[in-house]
């Protein structure tokens, strides 16, 4: 298989000049490093910071949404070290960690007014912040928390460079005083968990302090990453010495603590993944160990399997895993050059971003019980990383996509098998972002975000789809790169879409490209399963072309066909007439065959032999309709583009188009009737419909008004009967 390559779909969308200036002001000082990340929430934000300057931009357009320059209490301005999106009481904002000469400050920043509304001092140097909950009180929505935490109103986990883990009360029940970062409140740290939390909290708040629970006192080892996993109710804490800890927020106890395989390398990021319907209540946590910009060159991904005693669905609809039974490393992937052949010696590999994407099947497709906790039918983790190679000016950037369900299908190997590379792996797909680097150089990439809603596999080329269709290399998606100067959009297409695009571009020279095009379609899993075991050399060019045309129709790649037709008509190549005749005949034969198949499938709808249609048959009928609809578009293209054609030829062509159009409408009506429950037609007509499938009063009003109109127009000569 060839390498997959991302395509840039926009130029650089630069940040406003005012943003660039504000961020550039502090770049001269050593401590001021430009940091930038896409916010994980649904508000489409990206946050950039340099020294005391914070800039919040629209992640799609790059326009400035909010900005703030933090003030300090002494000559040295504070440095923005950590930023996390946070919403509370219908307000959208950020939790921000500032480093000062003496300790740190946690700020609650309101994006709506571009102001700090709450601030509290913290001990040490904050390295990460993670919201646990944005409200409080003993309500059903806080049942998963330790009783002591339920007395707090809004909780944020804060970690420091000396290993301290704090759970801070944000006091969201008291927003009476608007504080800025200079006026930060005091903090009272509780080491144990006292019984009288409400009483203590009231007293502490009266004294103008925030309460906080210390999960871990300073150990001297910096915390390098922090993530709250709501589905397991665990706080995942990664340390700079390669250890990972999991803290349960119900018991407020540490459930797991282990050093990952790459040893004393910081755990730089974690992300959660849940497979589809694991009967053992297993879910997974990726832990990424990375040296990033420091000495050494390590970037390794570790997949931890967490097995739980119970998996339940809360009243809110949220899934919750309970009772951790074990946690063990199940898969490791080293991304520092060895796993895929690179020319040259790598000097530094660093992670740019990691995220998990889940998609749940729509309600209509589900067979599970209503109260059963649903699992995602799509679950992928996306990793982006940058490889700097000695002697090369530009870095190489890659995007990898791990599909956990395909990993299950591959029987859960613990690493890549010998001779297996990332670009030919059945559960991991790899895209090169070379085009992005070329287009954006010398601007550094700060983060990459895949747009969840854009992730799709496209249309299956056949039913049942071939094995290759399920590999992650068939995914198509859009993403955005956050640079130090703006944003750039890109699209990643899978092998199938890329193959179809290749064919589309081949244009009039199709005849010369048939063997290559056929082979590409075969490898990409675009052809009917019957071609899998057939040697391409044993097929004629016509048969190969028919297979390619079928793939285009099945996958709704109509631009490919209509593009050929238009070009052959206008460019009049030597083979144009032959090609047009061949494609027209093939299209019409396909209409006939599909109509016959459709009629065969519909027999049980009308002969009273069945009372309901199984999902498989409904799917086949829908597939027939889709094919008929696509074929109709192709015939429509012939009809509208036809030139220098005999009268008889034109009549024949328009007849074909009209007939296919009517068949298409008929198929649409049949589908509507079966969706409405009016088909299949039972022998026993006394069977009551569960609900009226059409709105009688609306229809009655419509026809009454039409009758009145006709009577008016006919001046009494029209007989409504």
């Amino acid at each position: 298989m060839r390498d997959l390559r991302a395509q840039v779909t926009s130029g650089l969308l630069p940040f406003p000049e005012v943003t660039l200036q504000a961020l550039g002001e502090d770049e001269i000082t050593l401590e001021s490093v430009l940091r930038g990340k896409f916010a994980a929430g649904k508000n489409g934000l990206a946050c950039l910071a340099c020294g005391p300057q914070l800039e919040v931009v629209n992640s799609i357009t790059g326009e400035r949404l909010s900005a703030y320059r933090f003030s300090g209490v002494n000559e040295q301005p504070p440095v923005v070290l950590a930023v996390k999106e946070f919403s509370w009481q219908k307000r959208t904002g950020l939790l921000i960690g500032l480093e000062e000469t003496e300790g740190s400050v946690l700020c609650l920043y309101d994006l709506g007014i571009s102001k700090v509304v709450k601030a509290v001092v913290l001990p040490g140097r904050v390295t990460a912040i993670e919201p646990i909950i944005n409200h409080g009180g003993a309500s059903a929505s806080t049942q998963h928390l330790h009783p002591s935490l339920r007395w707090l109103f809004g909780v944020a986990a804060v970690v420091t460079d000396v290993g301290q883990i704090l759970l801070v009360d944000l006091c969201l029940d008291d927003l009476s005083c608007n504080q800025n970062e200079v006026e930060a409140s005091d903090l009272e740290v509780l080491t144990g968990i006292p019984a009288e939390v409400p009483h203590i909290r009231e007293s502490v708040m009266r004294q103008g302090r925030h309460l906080c629970f210390q999960l871990v006192s300073p150990t001297g080892t910096a915390v390098s990453t922090l993530s709250y996993i709501s589905r397991t109710n665990q706080l995942a804490v990664g340390f700079s010495d390669g250890y990972l800890a999991l803290w349960n927020m119900k018991s407020m106890k540490r459930e797991y603590y282990i050093q990952l395989e790459s040893g004393q390398v910081p755990v730089y990021a974690v992300t959660f993944q849940e497979p589809e319907n694991d009967p053992r209540n297993c879910c997974y946590l990726w832990a990424v160990q990375s040296t990033q910009d420091s000495e050494g060159d390590v970037l390794s991904l570790h997949l931890l399997q967490l097995a739980f005693g119970n998996r339940k669905c809360l009243a809110s609809g949220q899934i919750l895993y309970e009772g951790l039974e074990y946690c063990e490393e199940r898969y490791t992937l080293d991304l520092t050059g060895g796993m895929f052949p690179l020319r040259g010696q790598t000097s530094n590999t660093k992670l740019l971003g990691c995220q998990s994407i889940e998609k749940f099947r729509s309600h209509g497709d589900r067979e599970e019980g209503v109260n059963e906790a649903l699992s995602p039918d799509t679950s992928v983790s996306v990793f982006t990383w940058q490889v700097n190679i000695y002697g090369q000016g530009k870095p190489s950037v890659y995007l990898g996509l791990f599909d956990i369900n395909r990993w299950y299908h591959a029987q859960m190997p613990d690493s890549l098998r010998s001779g297996e590379y990332l670009h030919n792996c059945s559960y991991f797909a790899l895209w090169s972002l070379e085009s992005v680097v070329s287009r954006t150089s010398p601007h550094g990439i700060l983060d990459i975000l895949v747009h969840e809603r854009s992730l799709n596999r496209g249309v299956p080329p056949s039913y049942p789809p071939p094995e290759q269709f399920f590999n992650p290399s068939t995914y198509n998606f859009d993403a955005t790169c956050l640079l130090n100067s703006g944003v750039v959009h890109l699209t990643c297409t899978g092998f199938q879409k890329e193959t179809l695009t290749f064919l589309k571009k081949s244009g009039p020279s199709l005849n010369e490209l048939i063997p290559d095009g056929y082979n590409r379609c075969l490898v990409a899993g675009l052809l009917s399963p019957r071609f899998v075991d057939v040697q391409p050399s044993s097929l004629s060019q016509e048969e190969q072309l028919e297979a390619i045309l079928s793939a285009a129709i099945q996958t709704s790649s109509l631009g490919l066909l209509t593009g050929y037709i238009r070009r052959w008509i206008t460019e009049e190549q030597p083979n144009s007439a032959t090609n047009l005749r061949f494609v027209l005949e093939w299209t019409w034969n396909k209409v006939v065959l599909t109509k016959e198949e459709f009629d065969r499938l519909c027999v049980p709808l009308f002969d009273g032999s069945c009372h309901f249609m199984d999902p498989q048959t409904i799917q086949s009928i829908q597939q027939c309709y889709l094919l008929l609809s696509n074929l109709n578009i192709v015939l429509s293209c012939f009809a509208s583009e036809a030139r220098e054609i005999t009268e008889r030829g034109l009549i024949d062509l328009s007849n074909k188009f009209v007939v296919s159009h009517l068949i298409c409408q008929y198929a649409q009506v049949v589908l509507w009737f079966s969706h409405s429950g009016l088909l299949p037609e039972g022998i026993d007509d006394s069977v009551q419909l569960s609900r009226l499938c059409y709105n009688y009063p609306v229809i009655q009003n419509y026809y009454t008004s039409r009758r009145q109109k006709f009577e008016r127009l006919s001046r009494g000569k029209w007989n409504p009967d």
Partner: nanobody, 124 residues
Amino acid sequence: QVQLVESGGGLVQPGGSLRLSCAVSGVDLSRVGVSWIRQAPGRGLEWVSKILNNGTNTAYAASVKGRFTISRDNAKNTVYLQMNNLKSEDTAMYYCAQGLVQDSQGLVLSSRIRGQGTQVTVSS
């Protein structure tokens, strides 16, 4: 830049009184809470008293309650600590501070900003 400057310390006999002052600059006193903390020889920093930004809410450590009174003058941007009935165990360096991290026993773990301090010695 926020600055805190303490004054008023000195040598006093047990049972005597002293009034410490803390001149605040760089921030509006009506917007921040200010604390007095102290450090006795060979001991950690101990929280003594606090006055909140509203000026009415005050708090005291159990060891000084009833003997010490914290107040402020917003016009002069100054915080005061009136210390009566002083005991030998009150001997310490007294600091005016803002932005404290402390434990439930009143031990000060860190302070965001504090003055140079003023020495109070209670001795006969």
